[in-house]
Interface confidence: low
Amino acid sequence: LKGQEFAPSHQQVYAPLRADGDKPRAHLTVVRQTPTQHLKNQFPALHWEHELGLAFTKNRMNYTNKFLLIPESGDYFVYSQVTFRGMTSECSEIRQAGRPNKPDSITVVITKVTDSYPEPTQLLMGTKSVCEVGSNWFQPIYLGAMFSLQEGDKLMVNVSDISLVDYTKEDKTFFGAFLL
Amino acid sequence: LKGQEFAPSHQQVYAPLRADGDKPRAHLTVVRQTPTQHLKNQFPALHWEHELGLAFTKNRMNYTNKFLLIPESGDYFVYSQVTFRGMTSECSEIRQAGRPNKPDSITVVITKVTDSYPEPTQLLMGTKSVCEVGSNWFQPIYLGAMFSLQEGDKLMVNVSDISLVDYTKEDKTFFGAFLL
Amino acid sequence: LKGQEFAPSHQQVYAPLRADGDKPRAHLTVVRQTPTQHLKNQFPALHWEHELGLAFTKNRMNYTNKFLLIPESGDYFVYSQVTFRGMTSECSEIRQAGRPNKPDSITVVITKVTDSYPEPTQLLMGTKSVCEVGSNWFQPIYLGAMFSLQEGDKLMVNVSDISLVDYTKEDKTFFGAFLL
């Protein structure tokens, strides 16, 4: 094939072509969480496995200290699943008394931090009430969407309660991003 | 535009450029499942529609005998949703007696099989307790993430109980993968 | 690097190469919904923010009147999350009487409309029974998959009950699509 069949002169191109295998990508998997002090008004962040098993980072996408570092500006697909597990929710007794109440809940947030700006940006949130009667319970929350990110942005996953996160299997709780 | 604007000489390229429309892709949709014998310690695999309606396979991504066949090595985004439906969960009676118990559950697993390796690898799992009292219930489990796959790998979707899978509509239960 | 390393002569190319940053993409976020008359047999469609905050449309992907307009044919990844919230489900009283019943439910559908064809096509559906006793409840439904779309196709998100949609935060309820 001739060169021009690859890059026709009439084509509008706003960015240079690049090989897809060269794009920043990461898939991180759950590890046992070490309890940490977290800010009073912010959900704690999870830390992750970035090398072993199914986990990887490539093409300058790096993982450090709970953050995925965005190495170049562009549109990224960002995703995470967190599987939660717990004992009977407190709200069951109140429910049996027939009174509406604010239920217990589980929440996952994918957050963007930009060093030049003090306030984190919540990109994605999955939040669910949990009102299970008389049993252990477990369930996943999945999130994924596309965002325009800037070089130097950092991504993390925050949860409402680290003690409820199922860290037992790499396929149950994970976090990833890739440049489109 | 000049050729070099498409492929600047300073660009590091780790793989040859390729047209996006040429990449292996598949979206499979649910069909009525025929009961099959499955291995004692492994969840049964679903089989799928690969041609009709919304379903398709393209660019050497083939479907055969419950498996998606990976035709070339690279990073793939893999996803599935399974909608489950059932009658009242067994655990409801025990719950009413006020005793905690191991609840019924629904589980989806996306599994990778590599012929050269005996053990399947669980890539993704969505698992949820189901403890519904006195009603029919239905709910989806969605999964999706990126994995580095090798030519010849095979992907399948396993579920905890085939009889609970909603096979009535192609938009409720599906399975797909595409090379990034 | 030489040009032929970018576009090797042995490579089969079915479509011209293009810069990834030039592909149609959109991420839309929730806004407060204005009640509208909807067709008797069709769930109401949500309308969306397309410019402010995290929302954007680019490269000829336009949003108008509840629809994302597909500007060129190809394979798209399409996704949405809708967070629902409500008061105790009606079914609780019937459940307490010990009789199975058809539960309340929440449903999200991503629908494709093609002007040349009278019937909309349901691409994705997430549907869930809701039978919560004695409490407020909230929960997300997430959907995402790949579809072959044609130039001129229109995508929308329909829900079973607009009044239950959580419109308070752009990270809770969203809708997007991008050309692969």
């Epitope: 930009t114 | - | 410019e51 905050g53 449309t57 336009n62």
Partner: antibody, heavy 116, light 112 residues
Framework: QVQLQQSGPELVKPGASVKLSCKAS????????INWVKQRPGQGLEWIGW????????NYNEKFKGKATLTVDTSSSTAYMDLHSLTSEDSAVYFC?????????WGQGTTLTVSS | DVVMTQTPLSLPVSLGDQASISCRSS???????????LEWYLQKPGQSPKLLIY???NRFSGVPDRFSGSGSGTDFTLKISRVEAEDLGVYYC?????????FGGGTKLEIK
Amino acid sequence: QVQLQQSGPELVKPGASVKLSCKASGYTFTSIDINWVKQRPGQGLEWIGWIYPRDGRTNYNEKFKGKATLTVDTSSSTAYMDLHSLTSEDSAVYFCARYTSSLDYWGQGTTLTVSS
Amino acid sequence: DVVMTQTPLSLPVSLGDQASISCRSSQSIVHSNGNTYLEWYLQKPGQSPKLLIYKVSNRFSGVPDRFSGSGSGTDFTLKISRVEAEDLGVYYCFQGSHVPYTFGGGTKLEIK
């Protein structure tokens, strides 16, 4: 209703710096760009730059790089513009305006006079 | 930078007349998302500019329907069907498609 309230007039000496403010109300401050515009006496309008309050991202007209610095305080829904190394050329009315798909709401303007 | 050229510089009219102001951009101001962010503003003495028209032809809320915008690519027009006393002032076109955003030089609408 949407309002942008700007700080009062400033008289400053050449070489000094000044900080102008623009307090937003009536909408979600973090979601919408704040733009700044300069108007010299009897002249037209010049765009200085914008800031996106949610993450502090900025974009400047090259002409004003080094002259203007845009910042925000989300806790008070206030945008600021610092002007440095002032000269008589900086004497002007400065407007803040929010940009949705247009500069739909403007502040009343702050008059800056640079004089010794 | 995109240069926005407005004509005429001054437009003397009688009340009740139709007025037309032209704005030409030095290059296309179609954004990569397909939208054209071309706006018209009116500034009266001692006041801040007020938005009249956005995205070429959309009237801002509260703007009377005697104001209309049209055009595409690089040529745009603001029309006032019947000029009223409150319409007098300086009109500016503005493009928000390409950074740096730029204003036209202004057109003064005044009584003959």
